[in-house]
């Protein structure tokens, strides 16, 4: 029967008595930077070309005995998970291996850099189809390793890496912390985060998604027909490298941004038990388990968006946090979140010719996060319209006044330390879908976009008194682009998007002792692209 | 522009015999930074990745590496250039004493220097 991990990543329509999805990634080359591998193992023979690249440190210990099967163990298993005949994800993908880890599974940042440079030079000498680079390794945070990954990604290469097995914030490790890399955490057959001895999978905002990473059956270097079960975020990353190879084989022109958005879009949502993660990391960690798309084509009509969290601002009075989208994504909205509730909102601003989302901490606050909603919107022309604090009037309002521009997100930023002491009336933006409304002492920022066939609508859900969380979701066929709260009182900890749901978090009334007069409303802006839908229908 | 370690003129003469053109002095106002792994057991002191500014050409990388070797030798330190990077990042990998970091950070074109560190199979 089909191994649990292959079943988990396979959409129901492919689930017969065996795993045989269409097109096994035959147009794609997957580079593996790992240990040496047994390339003639029955599971991978003819699928893996061992390059002559080798850059590894000496093994530790004077009595170390170099046993070939042990030296090859990690890399052979991963090559099998990516492209193995019987237990592989992308059975048609061809692979090239570079040895950057020694027989003890240890390498260096410098050796990995030289390996990445080797791949870039090979790509220039002999351009082939799409390239996926699998980095099933981790070290401490490294500026230079992250920079090299960024350069390779900008050269059109898809990099996939292990989040790390340290039961820690993946942002503290490299290449897991590189924003351009697809970083993968590990889950088990019960969709729980994987525990590995006293440690386990890494987590946090630097993880893009999770994938099967416990008891994964794959090629064993113990013999040419042997299989073995291994666990770790390397195994999880190998699944995503295989899925990426299949997606790129079906759509070779996909950019890294498009691929990442599709991986997120087709993932199983909200199946991971978040209680395993430290409390402060739960909101930052994506609840996504990778899966193959239900069909190899036809996803192009969707408006894809993802949520990007910034690093924590830190607690100083003027601290800010910035969340950025990838180069070919559009920032369609910006929100902020603070566990203490002490924040001064957020704003979209230009930085280096691109919009970024900046959140502001407040005096006495423990720090804030900026949350960017990053979307794929071809031929988009977006701008930010700002209204300064209205002071005397009912509230601050701003709308998209340019012809053909629609509202995709609202942000508000204030200088006063605590808006809660300046209670405004609750404002309703009824009848004016292209308008942002906020506190009279806040400046309001509207994200206004023009793109072919783009249409958006506002959805709200309010509850009479703060109860910890208010949510509002976009319906099928619509994509959440903006998420904000009304009003911006001190009750509100912040707003953020989780998949297609806008979540507004607020302090519980019971803990603040406030009156129940104040309602908290979650405001979602839901968009779709008629242009993309029509274009895809014309293709079919 | 004067080289802060006083070796600049002497070195230029040495370089001139090797190749045409004056070796550039470091730009003022931009300070190169040093980075190392926060996890102490994973550090590999003695090997450093010297990363040069983005538009640096291979020839300049090689020249900067030779300059470092020359200045280090003058101070009685042996250095070994293990690899010159080009294609992804401009720079070089050098085996040297940590005592030379201050000197290396003042070299022209240097953006930052990172001490090598371990990575592990996951």
């Amino acid at each position: 029967s089909i191994p649990w991990n292959l079943e988990r990543i396979t959409p129901p329509r492919y689930r017969a008595d065996e795993y045989q999805p269409p097109d096994g990634g035959s147009l794609v080359e997957v580079y593996l930077l790992d240990t040496s591998i047994q390339s003639d193992h029955r599971e991978i023979e003819g699928r893996v070309m061992v390059t002559d690249f080798e850059n590894v440190p000496e093994e530790d210990g004077t009595r170390f005995h170099r046993q070939a099967s042990k030296c090859d163990s990690h890399g052979t298993h991963l090559a099998g998970v990516v492209s193995g005949r019987d237990a592989g994800v992308a059975k048609g993908a061809s692979m090239r291996s570079l040895r950057v880890l020694n027989c003890q599974g240890k390498g260096t940042v410098s050796g990995t850099l030289i390996g990445l440079e080797f791949i870039r030079k090979s790509q220039l000498v002999q351009p082939v189809g799409p390239l996926v680079v699998l980095l099933p390794l981790a070290g401490g945070y490294s500026r230079v390793l992250n920079a090299a990954c960024q350069r390779l990604a900008r050269a059109g290469v898809v990099l996939v890496t292990a989040a790390g097995n340290f039961r820690d914030d993946a942002c503290l490790y490299s290449p897991a912390s590189a924003p351009e890399v697809i970083t993968v955490g590990a889950t088990n057959a019960q969709d729980q985060p994987v525990t590995l001895g006293t440690l386990g999978t890494n987590f946090g905002r630097c993880v893009d998604l999770f994938a099967p990473g416990e008891d994964i059956i794959g090629a064993s270097s113990d013999c040419s027909t042997c299989f073995v079960s291994q666990s770790g975020t390397s195994q999880a990353a190998a699944h995503v490298a295989g899925i990426a190879a299949m997606m790129l084989s079906a759509e070779p022109e996909l950019t890294l941004a498009e691929l990442r958005q599709r991986l997120i879009h087709f993932s199983a949502k909200d199946v991971i038990n978040e209680a395993w993660f430290p409390e402060d990391q739960r909101v930052l960690t994506p609840n996504l388990v990778a899966a193959l798309p239900p069909s190899t084509h036809g996803a192009g009509w969707q408006l894809f968006c993802r949520t990007v969290w910034s690093a924590h601002s830190g607690p100083t009075r003027m601290a800010t946090a910035i969340a950025r989208c990838a180069p070919d994504e559009e920032l369609l909205s910006c929100s902020s979140f603070s566990r203490s509730g002490k924040r001064r909102g957020e704003r979209m601003e230009a930085q280096g010719g691109k919009l970024v989302c900046r959140a502001h901490n407040a005096f006495g606050g423990e720090g804030v996060y900026a949350i960017a909603r990053c979307c794929l919107l071809p031929q988009a022309n977006c701008s930010v319209h700002t209204a300064p604090p209205a002071e005397a009037s009912m509230g601050t309002r701003v709308h998209c006044h340019q012809q053909g521009h629609v509202l995709t997100g609202c942000s508000s930023h204030w200088e006063v330390e605590d808006l809660g002491t300046h209670k405004p009336p609750v404002l309703r933006p009824r009848g004016q879908p292209n308008q942002c409304v906020g506190h009279r002492e806040a400046s309001i920022h509207a994200s206004c976009c023009h793109a072919p066939g783009l249409e958006c609508k506002v959805k709200e859900h309010g509850i009479p008194a703060p109860q910890g969380q208010v949510t509002v979701a976009c319906e099928e066929g619509w994509t959440l682009t903006g998420c904000s709260a009304l009003p911006g009182t001190s009750h509100v900890l912040g707003a953020y998007a989780v998949d297609n749901t806008c979540v507004v978090r607020s302090r519980d009334v019971s803990t603040t002792g406030s009156t129940s007069e104040e309602a908290v409303t979650a405001v979602a802006i839901c968009c779709r692209s008629r242009h993309l839908a029509q274009a895809s229908q014309e293709l079919q | 522009q004067e080289d802060e370690d006083g070796d600049y003129e002497e070195l230029v003469l040495a370089l001139r015999s090797e190749e045409d053109g004056l070796a550039e002095a470091p730009e003022h106002g931009t300070t190169a930074t040093f980075h190392r792994c926060a996890k102490d057991p994973w550090r590999l002191p003695g090997t450093y990745v010297v990363v040069l500014k983005e538009e640096t050409h291979l020839s300049q990388s090689e020249r900067t590496a030779r300059r470092l070797q020359a200045q280090a030798a003058r101070r009685g330190y042996l250095t070994k250039i293990l690899h010159v990077f080009h294609g992804l990042l401009p720079g070089f990998l050098v085996k040297m004493s940590g005592d030379l970091l201050e000197l290396a950070l003042k070299l022209p074109h240097v953006d930052y220097i990172e001490e090598d560190s371990s990575v592990f199979a996951q």
Epitope: E18, Q20, Q38, S39, D40, R42, E45, G46, V48, M49, V50, A68, R85, D86, K91, C223, S224, T225 | -
Partner: antibody, heavy 115, light 110 residues
Framework: QVQLVQSGAEVKKPGASVKVSCKAS????????ISWVRQAPGQGLEWMGW????????NYAQKVQGRVTMTTDTSTSTVYMELRSLRSDDTAVYYC????????WGQGTTVTVSS | QSALTQPASVSGSPGQSITISCTGT?????????VSWYQQHPGKPPKLMIY???NRPSGVSIRFSGSKSGNTASLTISGLQAEDEADYFC?????????FGGGTKLTVLQ
């Protein structure tokens, strides 16, 4: 192009040994092992075993285990299959083929065991 | 006695389609994606026609196709031609080795 070239025909007496060679060329040797398959006159194919060019590891079929030895000489890209204690029912055409997938075959070596 | 069962012979006229079956168990055909089919003309070595159940090596006519259901694999040859007359063998992985079928003699009726 990918080629497997085998040694010439052999006639052996029962109890003797035979050593057949197979020289590989035209591909990355370490990406595939070599399988040995035999075919008795008018019969089907029988898989005898496999050897790795990468590390010399072997995998023998149970039926010939103990009588067969496969070796490699990486310097000449050649694989050898030695069969000992020959019997008359070992009379067959012996083929080498690339890997477990057996996508490329040698031309075959006829081994006749006769007293 | 071969591990995989094939019909001893099949025949068909030029232009027709024929199918050769290859039956094993869940420990071979049913358990692996690696069923291959070989064509062998008299006095010649076998030639790979289908690998991994349904894949065709380059140079093999599209008239040859393979499939698998449960523990049985099948080779279908459409638009029979005189040169298709040969012996056909299936093979499959087992946990530690390889097994072949006994072979099927295909006769193209003239």
């Amino acid at each position: 192009q990918v080629q497997l070239v085998q040694s010439g025909a052999e006639v052996k007496k029962p109890g003797a040994s035979v050593k057949v060679s197979c020289k590989a060329s035209g591909y990355t040797l370490t990406s595939y092992g070599i399988s040995w398959v035999r075919q008795a006159p008018g019969q089907g194919l029988e898989w005898m075993g496999w050897i790795s060019f990468y590390n010399g590891n072997t995998n023998y079929a149970q039926k010939v285990q103990g009588r067969v030895t496969m070796t490699t000489d990486t310097s000449t890209s050649t694989v050898y299959m030695e069969l000992r204690s020959l019997r008359s029912d070992d009379t067959a055409v012996y083929y080498c083929a690339r890997g477990y997938g057996m996508d490329v075959w040698g031309q075959g070596t006829t081994v006749t065991v006769s007293s | 006695q071969s591990a995989l069962t094939q019909p001893a012979s099949v025949s068909g006229s030029p232009g027709q389609s024929i199918t050769i079956s290859c039956t094993g168990t869940s420990s071979d055909v049913g358990g692996y994606n690696s069923v291959s089919w070989y064509q062998q003309h008299p006095g010649k070595p076998p030639k790979l026609m289908i690998y991994e159940v349904s894949n065709r090596p380059s140079g093999v006519s599209i008239r040859f196709s393979g499939s698998k259901s449960g523990n049985t694999a099948s080779l279908t040859i459409s638009g029979l031609q005189a040169e298709d007359e040969a012996d056909y063998f299936c093979s499959s992985y087992t946990s530690t080795s390889m097994v072949f079928g006994g072979g099927t003699k295909l006769t193209v009726l003239q």
